[in-house]
Structure formats: C-alpha cells, structure tokens
C-alpha cells in the first residue's frame, strides 16, 4: 500500500471549504496504484464529479458508496477519494461580486462584478465602485477598467 | 450601519430548552450567511453551525448536531438558535456573526453582542 | 478537526512596542496560493472585532498597525506600534476545512 504522499495525480483529495489538498506522486507509485490512503484509510475507487464518499473509507479496504453533493451549496469537479464535496463559492456583494453562472454539483459558483463596479486583475476576489466623473466621461466604466474622466476645464470636441 | 442585536440573558434549568434570537439591520439579511459562535465562560471562541438565510440550508459543527438548531424568519430579518436538552456545560456566551467570503475563505465581519446562557439547577 | 496553537498564550507590553503573536495550524490552510486564516480581537465583556481576512487583508476602519502574514501552518498578526486600545485577547480562525476551528486565544497586558 502507497503512503499518504503517494497518490494518483489525476485524483484530487478535496476537503469541505472546497479547497484541494494536492499529493505529490512518483511515475513509479502511480503505475502500481491500487488505492488511496487517507489519514490511515485507504479507498480503492474515487467517486465521480458530483459526488463524495458517503464516509471515510477504512483500514480494511471498506468501500463507501458514493453520493450527491448538495446542488448549489457544494460540488465537486474531479474524481477524488474524500468524504467531504468543495464548498460552493459565495459572490459576496460586500466585496461588489455577483453570481454569473450558479455552483452546480460538479462546477463552482462563477462569480462577476456587480453594475457599476469593476475588477482589473485576472482573477477577481473584490470589485471596485466604478469612479463617478464631475466633468464628463472619455471612457465608460467596463467589467475590467474603471471610468475615465474629463478633467475640470478640459473641452469636449 | 450594520447590526446584529441579540435577545438578553437567559437563566434555564437543566434539561430544559432555550432559544437565543439574533435581529440584523442595516444589509440585505437574504445575501449573506449567518454563524453561531460558543463561548464558555473564560474559554475561547468554538464555531457551532450556519444558516443561508435565502433558503434556511444549515450546516453544523458535527459537535452540536442535535444539540442546536438554526432557523431564520426572513420576515423580520432574525436568526435563531435553540439549544435543547441543557447541561451545565452549555452554560455560555453564544454570539450570533454575519459571513462574509473572501474568494472562498468564509470570515465573521460583524458580530452581535453576545447572549448569556445560564444552566443552573 | 484542524488544530490552531497560538503563541504566547499571553504576553506582557508597554505602549509602543512591537507585538508578534503566532498561530500554527496542524495541517496546512492554504489553498492555491491562498491562505484561509483570519485574526480577531476580543475585549472583556464584548463581541469579537474582525481585524485581518484571508491572511493578510486588513478589514476596513482597523488601524494600520495591524497586519497579517504567513502560508500553510505558520501565520503572524502583527502590531507595529502596541496603543492603550489594543490590549486585548487575540484569536486565529481557520476556514480551509469544516469545522471551523479558533485558536485558544492570545492575552496581550499592560506591562
């Protein structure tokens, strides 16, 4: 049997805030994996996406069935051995985000910026009120750029 | 300003049920998750449970299932938690907090202002 | 359950002073390049005071001399400059994995 560190790498372990727990694996280890031992279980069959292990798996090789994930509070998106789905991501509108596209059993919540706010990084964890101009607008607010403003005296062509 | 107000102190008998109330103003009671935090007396902060309030789904701390249950009336924007079959070591302060989630990491931003519960023959 | 061990369990410090106080967890609470620890503030007789999100973002309206720092197990809130007001309990909370777990809190006196 492999150690904990020694797991397939196309499985993903996944604990209940929907974070990924990833192994490290050699080529080796791989081509003569049976299961998964997790804090001193082992699993022989992940379940799909969508899905978790309705309990831990044991030491003597007990296999759990598989069940649903809560739909639209937890998902998984790999095959993986744990116990625990990935907790949906909330768009919190406190942080100017809301929901694009709804967590399914097998994808995260996809989240966006509310009207009128705006993210410039490639991954948006917080939007920002778009600026609200005094002396007229050259360019409107977008989704990924904030507002550009005339400054004061400026003359519109 | 946002606000969670909770009911006053209350004194019970062993074995007995209470139900703390937890009053929020000041945002959209709907879009955020609400949390229930133990304290007991001297002791630090242990998380007991949540509630989306847009659709009452609770999720527990496994320590407490079937010793508190969460309910929301969205009517008047309270969250409650009732404690049944009470023993000298749920004696506490019980804080009600409003979640807030930062790229996944769930965090309390606002907290109300404690309840004390006393079990006492 | 993830363990988080903060230390000093309490310490002594005059105003002015630099403060450190460390959380450890038993397992890691990063995921993905992002730290799921959170710092709180707690005076006798009140409710808990969020002062630091995710690690290191500082909640709004908390002071500057705060700060957050540290990935995987081993995390550091900070206070730059110790002020009468800041003599309190501190406490570390995890939320990379249910359920969520609390340090057992840090006393920070007036020496």
């Known amino acids: 049997r492999l150690s904990s560190k020694s797991v397939n790498a196309q499985v993903t372990d996944i604990n209940s805030k929907g974070l990924e727990l990833r192994k490290t694996v050699t080529t080796v280890e791989t081509q003569n994996l049976e299961g998964l031992h997790h804090d001193g279980q082992f699993c022989h069959k992940p379940c799909p996406p969508g899905e978790r292990k309705a309990r831990d798996c044991t030491v003597n090789g007990d296999e759990p069935d598989c069940v649903p994930c809560q739909e639209g509070k937890e998902y998984t998106d790999k095959a993986h051995f744990s116990s625990k789905c990935r907790r949906c991501r909330l768009c919190d509108e406190g942080h100017g985000l809301e929901v694009e596209i709804n967590c399914t059993r097998t994808q995260n919540t996809k989240c966006r910026c509310k009207p009128n706010f705006f993210c410039n990084s490639t991954v948006c964890e917080h939007c920002d009120p778009c600026t609200k101009c005094e002396h007229g607008i050259i360019k409107e607010c977008t989704l990924t750029s904030n507002t550009k403003c005339k400054e004061e005296g400026s003359r519109s062509n | 300003q946002v606000q969670l107000v909770q009911s006053g102190a209350e004194v019970k008998k062993p074995g007995a049920s209470v139900k703390v109330s937890c009053k929020a103003s000041g945002y959209t009671f709907t879009s955020y998750w609400m949390q229930w935090v133990k304290q007991a007396p001297g002791q630090g902060l242990e998380w007991m449970g949540e509630?989306?309030?847009?659709?009452?789904?609770?999720n527990y701390n496994q320590k407490f299932k079937g010793k508190a249950t969460i309910t929301v009336d969205t009517s008047t924007s309270t969250a409650y938690m009732e404690l049944s079959s009470l023993r000298s070591e749920d004696t506490a302060v019980y804080y009600c907090a409003r979640n807030r989630d930062y790229s996944n990491n769930w965090y309390f931003d606002v907290w109300g202002q404690g309840t004390l519960v006393t079990v006492s023959s | 359950d993830i363990v988080l061990t903060q230390s000093p369990s309490s310490l002594s410090a005059s105003v002015g002073d630099r403060v450190t106080i460390t959380c450890k967890a038993s397992?890691?609470?990063?995921?993905?390049?992002?730290?799921?620890m959170n710092w709180y503030q707690q005076k006798p007789g009140q409710a808990p005071k969020l002062l630091i999100y995710?690690?290191?973002n500082l909640e709004s309206g908390v002071p500057s001399r705060f700060s957050g720092s540290g990935s995987g197990t081993d995390f550091t809130l900070t206070i730059s400059s110790l002020q009468p007001e800041d003599f309190a309990t501190y406490y570390c909370q995890q939320s990379n994995e249910d359920p969520r777990t609390f340090g057992q809190g840090t006393k920070v006196e007036i020496k």
């Open positions: 509630i989306d309030p847009s659709d009452s789904y609770t």
């Open positions: 397992q890691s609470v990063d995921y993905d390049g992002d730290s799921y």
């Open positions: 995710a690690a290191s």
